[in-house]
């Protein structure tokens, strides 16, 4: 069936780009994981068998290509186990600070700008590497805070013209549009540097299987979306004879699949840093744009609730990230004790 083989091709492309060697092996060696995946993907038996064969081949290729993936993974796991307690403490500091900002609590030193209250809280230290891995890159350039998601290098620059980041005036300090522009550009440069430094290694570090059920269900849902989208494309009258490249299936519970066709994927945008695992368990939970830029909102009655809500949202994002990291830390600790 040509339709089925086109779907298998798309599925393999997805696994190549989005699933780590370790998680692919988990899927292929754990029957429960495989069955969970097949169920979540709603694959008919014949397609499941065909995909299984193709994935067996892919796994062999991946292992051949990266013989020391296991060692590298272990190396990054050890690094994470060592660094996490300190990072956890830093993240908790950040969460507390963001909550205090949201509540509008006065900081001891007079004339402190909100920006300065946050600066230092997300310090540029070795912890930044993990924060990039979590999907949040923090920067305190110029005393203000910007949180950027991986793969945003391209999209943001275009939007910069419309951005003013006057942060929030608390001590009569103003941030001009030019400074904001400069701040974001510098932050993007730093983000690129860090990402290039991490390179492919990030995928080994991040391939922590974690919750098998979540993992298989997550991949399954993406494959299901991809399969439905393929079916929808086939049913469109006058569809182009040449097959369009489907890069990013958008998982949705409803049947309304919005496919992005012929666009560079986030994977391609993020300069060789491979997204591993899938959304439910990945540290690379790709957020919509998570960065703090304020349009000269004052901490007075007018914009108080608006800015408070923004800050609470950022705090919540950090809390979610910390929970994911915490869970992975526990899993890794338990693995080590076995």
């Amino acid at each position: 069936d040509p339709e089925s083989s086109i779907f298998i091709e798309d599925a393999i492309k997805y696994f190549k780009e989005k699933v780590s060697t370790q998680n692919l092996l988990l899927l292929l060696t754990d029957n429960e994981a495989w069955n969970g995946f097949v169920a979540a993907a709603e694959l008919p038996r014949n397609e499941a068998d065909e995909l299984r064969k193709a994935l067996d081949n892919l796994a062999r290729q991946m292992i051949m290509k990266d013989k020391n993936w296991h060692d590298k993974g272990q190396q990054y796991r050890n690094w994470f186990l060592k660094e996490f307690p300190r990072l956890k403490s830093e993240l908790e500091d950040n969460i507390r600070r963001l909550r205090a900002l949201a509540d509008g609590v006065q900081k001891v030193h007079k004339g402190t700008t909100i920006a300065n209250v946050v600066s230092g809280s997300l310090s540029i230290s070795s912890g930044i590497l993990t924060l990039v891995g979590m999907g949040l890159a923090p920067f305190t350039e110029g005393g203000s805070l910007v949180l950027l998601e991986p793969g945003m290098e391209l999209g943001i620059t275009a939007a910069l013209t419309g951005i003013t980041s006057s942060t929030m005036d608390y001590g009569k300090k103003w941030w001009t549009q030019a400074q904001a522009h400069d701040l974001v550009i510098k932050s993007l440069d730093k983000l690129k540097e860090v990402r290039e430094f991490l390179g492919e290694n990030i995928s080994n570090f991040l391939s922590l299987a974690g919750n098998t059920y979540q993992l298989t269900r997550g991949i399954g849902k993406d494959i299901r979306a991809l399969r439905r989208a393929r079916a929808n494309l086939q049913s469109v009258p006058h569809a182009s004879a040449s097959r369009p490249r489907v890069t990013e299936p958008i998982s949705a519970e409803s049947g309304e699949q919005v496919e992005r066709v012929n666009e560079p994927s986030i994977l391609e945008m993020s300069r060789g840093v491979k997204l591993t695992d899938v959304a439910p368990v990945s540290f690379f939970l790709v957020l919509d744009v998570v960065y703090l830029v304020y349009e000269s909102k004052h901490l007075h009655e007018g914009a108080k609730s608006e800015t408070a809500e923004e800050l609470k949202k950022v705090a919540q994002e950090l809390e979610e990230k910390l929970n994911i990291l915490n869970n992975n830390y526990k899993i890794l600790q338990a693995d080590q004790e076995l």
Partner: antibody
């Protein structure tokens, strides 16, 4: 030295209004928030709300929204708690306390001596 | 709102003993927890802030610790002067709720 001095005990009738003052000294008033805490006889502490002495922004705990208002007289370094339409259950000792935030943690480091309010017909 | 559950409600111990009071938060408060001491007829006094930091002027016999959402206040080598009611407080976000209090008595 740092001090928060509250107004004296008060006896009021239900339906009346009371305004409790908290005069501060020994520190820069507008650098620290002021919060209010209630303790009914035989009960624990209840956080009522606070005021940002710099901006005048207030936040109240759910059960203290409506009849309770926290205000300032910055020139006199004084915070006020006003309770209107008094009820018998408002009988309690009310404390004002300085809210300190050092960039890491928030706490109430200096407290007033407390104001005992009795509401009785 | 974040709920703070303190235990025990009351306890009685002898001079020189070590006692521990615990406080649980209904959600993660990331170490933003304070302990206050309120002696009979006096205003509350800050004892511990940020779960583990001893407030200025307080005896080092008091110490705070944290394990996940559970927080503890340890009073070692109990003194008669420690007779008071102890309260924990969420200091992460408003409202800054208090625990129900633990009344400490000397046997």
């Amino acid at each position: 030295q740092i001090q928060l001095v509250q107004s004296g005990p008060d006896l009021k009738k239900p339906g009346e209004t009371v305004k409790i003052s908290c005069r501060t000294s020994g520190y820069a008033f507008t650098n620290y928030g002021v919060n209010w805490v209630k303790q009914a006889p035989g009960k624990g502490l209840k956080w009522m709300g606070w005021i940002n002495t710099n901006t005048g922004q207030t936040t109240y705990a759910e059960e203290f929204r409506g009849r309770f208002a926290i205000s300032l007289e910055t020139s006199a370094s004084t915070a006020f708690l006003t309770i209107s339409n008094l009820k018998n259950e408002d009988s309690a000792t009310y404390f004002c306390a300085r809210l300190i935030y050092d960039g890491d943690y928030i706490s109430s480091d200096f407290w007033g001596q407390g104001t005992t309010l009795t509401v009785s017909s | 709102d974040i709920q703070m559950t303190q235990s025990p409600d009351s306890l009685s111990a002898s001079v020189g003993e070590t006692v521990t009071i615990t406080c649980g938060a209904s959600e993660n408060i990331y170490g933003a927890l304070n302990w206050y001491q309120r002696k009979q007829g006096k205003s509350p006094q800050l004892l511990i802030y940020g779960a583990t930091n001893l407030a200025d002027g307080m005896s080092s016999r008091f110490s705070g610790s944290r394990s996940g959402r559970q927080y503890s206040l340890k009073i070692s080598s109990l003194h008669p002067d420690d007779v008071a009611t102890y309260y924990c407080q969420n200091a992460l976000s408003m409202p800054y709720t208090f625990g129900g209090g633990t009344k400490l008595e000397i046997k």
